[in-house]
């Protein structure tokens, strides 16, 4: 089977959502946990993560073979404390398989804005913290 993990971000007003999406087959979900780490280059684990989520075994419908499960970590107001390097990971507690997504960063600037860099598929986002809009 093939399990795929991607990272993305979205902004809602002053909130920043960091999203880890895992695509997997129904039968591959059992025992899998997806988690988001900050500033953990080597020891990213569910125990040291900001948030974790068990993969769903049921896509809700029967006519599909692949499921997407989404972990969303919401930062209500980005501050300098949120600057750092983030990574989406997944691990099977059953088989020991480990997946690591690309590193991405939040950079808080002196002007009160922040940027999210390192996201794939045109996901380099630059946000204005004060205005709450894409800049």
């Amino acid at each position: 089977g093939c399990i795929n993990i991607t990272s993305s971000a979205s902004q809602e007003g002053t909130r920043l959502n960091l999203i880890c999406t895992v695509w997997h087959k129904k039968e591959e979900a059992e025992g899998f946990v997806v988690f988001l780490c900050k500033d953990r280059s080597g020891d990213c684990s569910p125990e040291t993560s900001l948030k974790q989520l068990r993969l769903k075994r049921d896509p809700g419908i029967d006519g599909v073979g692949e499921i997407s499960s989404q972990l969303m970590f919401t930062i209500s107001q980005v501050t300098p404390l949120h600057s750092g390097t983030y990574q989406c990971c997944a691990r099977s507690q059953k088989s020991g398989i480990r997946l690591q997504g690309h590193f991405f960063s939040i950079l808080f600037t002196e002007t009160g804005n922040y940027t999210v860099t390192g996201l794939k598929q045109r996901q380099h986002l630059e946000f204005s913290h004060n205005e709450g809009t894409l800049s």
């Epitope: 049921d58 419908i61 029967d62 006519g63 969303m72």
Partner: antibody, heavy 121, light 107 residues
Framework: QVQLVQSGAEVKKPGASVKVSCKAS????????MQWIRQAPGQGLEWIGA????????RVTQKFRGRATLTADKSTSTAYMELSSLRSEDTAVYYC??????????????WGQGTTLTVSS | EIVLTQSPATLSLSPGERATLSCRAS??????LHWYQQKPGQAPRLLIK???QSISGIPARFSGSGSGTDFTLTISSLEPEDFAVYFC?????????FGGGTKVEIK
């Protein structure tokens, strides 16, 4: 044993909103899709949408998109369905129902008792 | 959206008779179809899962068949408590949908 207990009957005016709750017990709430279905007086069953409490993945049918909001509180094992901009045609019994294990049951194996919503000026 | 068409809308039969209810899907849904029974003032009850699989606690006189687009619910010998409304529902794709229902009434 699995139980779904819904909130009581509601009477609302056109344009108002309503929030119906469905408290689940007897199973792992976050592992099963919760459905919302309604039935107007003398009519058939109409699927509104579903939510997976494990990751808050929610699906709402086109007709109710923008008007129905599905949420779930894992700490209390309670699912909610909020319907806004109510009109008289929304008068119906609203049910929550659990989708059974995929490929094993698949259908809606447990149902709430129903919540009657009356929209009238 | 998959449309499920149930026929007939009403079936008038006597106790002891055989009831045959039909559900037709607007496109192929494999065996991803379920049947429910609903009595007045009650929530629906799951009768048959995945077109033909029985449910624990449901009498053996209820059976289902079909695959693809055409499905049938059969009640081999109607009991007084079987007079109710029957709905089919597909779980093949979003949005999930129900058929319009068939009312089985006493002749």
């Amino acid at each position: 044993q699995v139980q779904l207990v819904q909130s009581g009957a509601e009477v609302k005016k056109p344009g108002a909103s309503v929030k119906v709750s469905c408290k689940a017990s007897g199973y792992t709430f976050s592992d099963f899709w919760m459905q919302w279905i309604r039935q107007a007086p003398g009519q058939g069953l109409e699927w509104i949408g579903a939510i997976y409490p494990g990751d808050d993945d929610a699906r709402v049918t086109q007709k109710f998109r923008g008007r129905a909001t599905l949420t779930a509180d894992k700490s209390t094992s309670t699912a909610y369905m909020e319907l806004s901009s109510l009109r008289s045609e929304d008068t119906a019994v609203y049910y929550c129902a659990r989708r059974g294990i995929a490929a094993v049951v698949g259908g809606f194996d447990y149902w709430g008792q129903g919540t009657t919503l009356t929209v009238s000026s | 959206e998959i449309v499920l068409t149930q026929s007939p809308a009403t079936l008038s039969l006597s106790p002891g008779e055989r009831a045959t209810l039909s559900c037709r899907a607007s496109q192929s849904i494999s065996n991803h179809l379920h049947w429910y029974q609903q009595k007045p003032g009650q929530a629906p009850r799951l009768l048959i899962k995945y077109a033909s699989q029985s449910i624990s606690g449901i009498p053996a006189r209820f059976s289902g068949s079909g695959s693809g687009t055409d499905f049938t619910l059969t009640i081999s010998s109607l009991e007084p408590e079987d007079f109710a409304v029957y709905f089919c529902q597909q779980s093949n794709s979003w949005p999930l949908t129900f058929g319009g229902g068939t009312k089985v009434e006493i002749k």
